[in-house]
């Protein structure tokens, strides 16, 4: 019961996880504009990984795709696989996981075939969220980096007499989506990995016993028997399990709280 | 058809203070930015004040700043700017104006009202 | 705060001559973001409020005659009148709607000979 729990629990939260991690990807506010010690513009602009927009006072808002490839910074382009790959990854998992879940019965698939299934999907949903998590990373950091040449650029001399406005952008909200996404997947995938544990058949192993009959010396060693019913009282066989003792853990993750400008 | 009027002007001694009015027709005002600008006798034109349609950004001109306040009720679809420390140099047309819809501009603008400020 | 400088301050012209009136800002009113200029141009005739005629450097508001165009980018910019007409006399501003506090110029009035 506990396994179902664990895994339905693993599929649930990768699934969240994963429509974060698609919803990150779509939205626009990566970057947003620095509202902070700036001159005071009609004008709010904010970024994404396929467009930028600009929202003005009147709430009229403009979008202009990134119409190019090859004119884009690599890093934005690594972002971008990033994000694809987590999401790819992210959705085959759960499709893996569906055929996967306990409570759900396909045919005549065995539980070592569910055990694996389990396996693969958790793999995928790390390996996802991971992908997630770095792309965001990725992004953040090249914002940091960009937000102090800015700003190093704002108090620094201008060469000619005429001054441009020099937008400096800040961390957006698609980027703790992508962080918060990312960890869930990461969670959701740890579980069903655990809850593969579970699934794996458990291999039983009975001692050999010999029975004496009359007149006979003959040592009957009944094979281990793959499943057990576990009723009645089994008198003649000691059974003994391999790996009896097994843990689950409670993975908890603790929401932070990030203020930005 | 979009109106925009303007009262409250008047004369004023210098220290005084008095509030105009702008009431408003013709489209949503609560959708949309407002501001007043005025323009002192046979002079050019000089933005005093913007707030937004939900009032979360005011802004003022250096020159009136901490001396006038700019406030709307959208409920009544009126602007007002209430004028404290009057002096000579704010002697103006007030127009009220509406924020347009698109490039920020000044699209549409009232009549104007007449603030004088003399002694 | 961004000043905005016109030149000339007036100028007398012909009817059906064409006239180009220019507009400077101490700081670039290109916003990158949406690749625009967030400048105005409005024209205001004696005895009457001023009234809209370009936004955003170059897009004429609705109703105004094809014969105003507005050009330029970041700090430099043009009202052209192609061919004046009588009811053309007024004076013209331009603004800076990018920046707060927004600023005017101090205007380009416009006379018939």
């Known amino acids: 019961m506990a396994v179902t729990a664990c895994q339905g629990l693993g599929f649930v939260v990768s699934l969240i996880g994963i429509a974060g991690i698609i919803a990150a990807t779509c939205m626009d506010q990566w970057s947003t504009q620095d509202l902070y010690n700036n001159p005071v513009t009609a004008v709010f602009n904010y970024q994404g990984l396929w467009r930028s927009c600009v929202r003005e006072s009147s709430g009229f808002t403009e979008c202009r795709g990134y119409f190019t490839l090859l004119g884009l910074p690599a890093m934005l382009q690594a972002v971008r696989a990033l994000m694809i790959v987590g999401i790819v990854l992210g959705a085959i998992g759960l499709l893996v996981s569906i055929f996967a879940l306990k409570c759900i019965r396909i045919g005549s698939m065995e539980d070592s075939a569910k055990a694996n299934m389990t396996l693969t999907s958790g793999i995928m949903f790390i390996v996802s969220g991971l992908c997630a998590i770095a792309g965001v990373s990725v992004f953040a950091n090249m914002l940091v980096t960009n937000f102090w040449m800015s700003t190093a650029n704002m108090y620094t001399g201008m060469g000619g007499m005429v001054q441009t406005v020099q937008t400096r952008y800040t961390f957006g909200a698609a980027l703790f989506v992508g962080w918060v996404a990312g960890g869930l997947t990461l969670i959701g995938g740890v579980m069903m990995c655990i809850a593969c544990r579970g699934l794996a058949p458990e291999e039983t192993n009975y001692k050999a016993v010999s029975y004496h009959a009359s007149g006979h010396s003959v040592a009957y060693k009944p094979g281990g028997f793959k499943a057990s019913t576990g009723f009645g009282s089994n008198t003649k066989n000691k059974k003994i399990y391999d790996g009896g003792a097994r843990t689950e853990d409670e993975v908890q993750s603790y929401p932070s709280k990030h203020d930005y400008v | 058809e979009v109106q925009l009027v303007e009262s409250g002007g008047g004369l004023v001694q210098p220290g005084g203070s008095l509030r105009l009015s702008c009431a408003v027709s013709?489209?949503?005002?609560?959708?949309?930015?407002m501001h007043w600008v005025r323009q002192a006798p046979g002079k050019g034109l000089e933005w005093v004040a913007y707030i937004s349609s939900g009032t979360t950004n005011i802004y003022y001109a250096d020159s009136v700043k901490g001396r006038f306040t700019v406030s709307r009720d959208n409920a009544k679809n009126s602007l007002y700017l209430q004028m404290n420390s009057l002096r000579a140099e704010d002697t103006a047309v007030y127009y009220c104006?509406?924020?347009?819809?698109?490039?920020?501009?000044?699209?549409?603008w009232g009549q104007g009202t007449l603030v004088t400020v003399s002694s | 705060d961004i000043v905005m400088t016109q030149s000339p301050d007036s100028l007398a012209v012909s009817l059906g001559e064409r006239v180009t009136m220019n507009c400077k800002s101490s700081q670039s009113l290109f916003n990158s973001g949406n690749q625009r200029n967030y400048l105005t141009w409005y024209q205001q005739k004696p005895g009457q409020p001023p009234k809209l005629l370009i936004y955003w450097a170059s897009t004429r508001e609705s109703g105004v005659p094809d014969r105003f165009s507005g050009s330029g980018s970041g700090t430099d910019f043009t009202l052209t009148i192609s061919s004046v007409q009588a009811e053309d006399v007024a004076v013209y501003y331009c603004?800076?709607?990018?920046?707060?506090?927004?600023?005017f110029g101090q205007g380009t009035k416009l006379e018939i000979k």
């Open positions: 104006v509406r924020s347009g819809y698109y490039g920020s501009s000044l699209d549409y």
């Open positions: 603004q800076n709607v990018y920046i707060y506090p927004l600023t």
């Open positions: 013709g489209f949503t005002f609560s959708s949309f930015g």
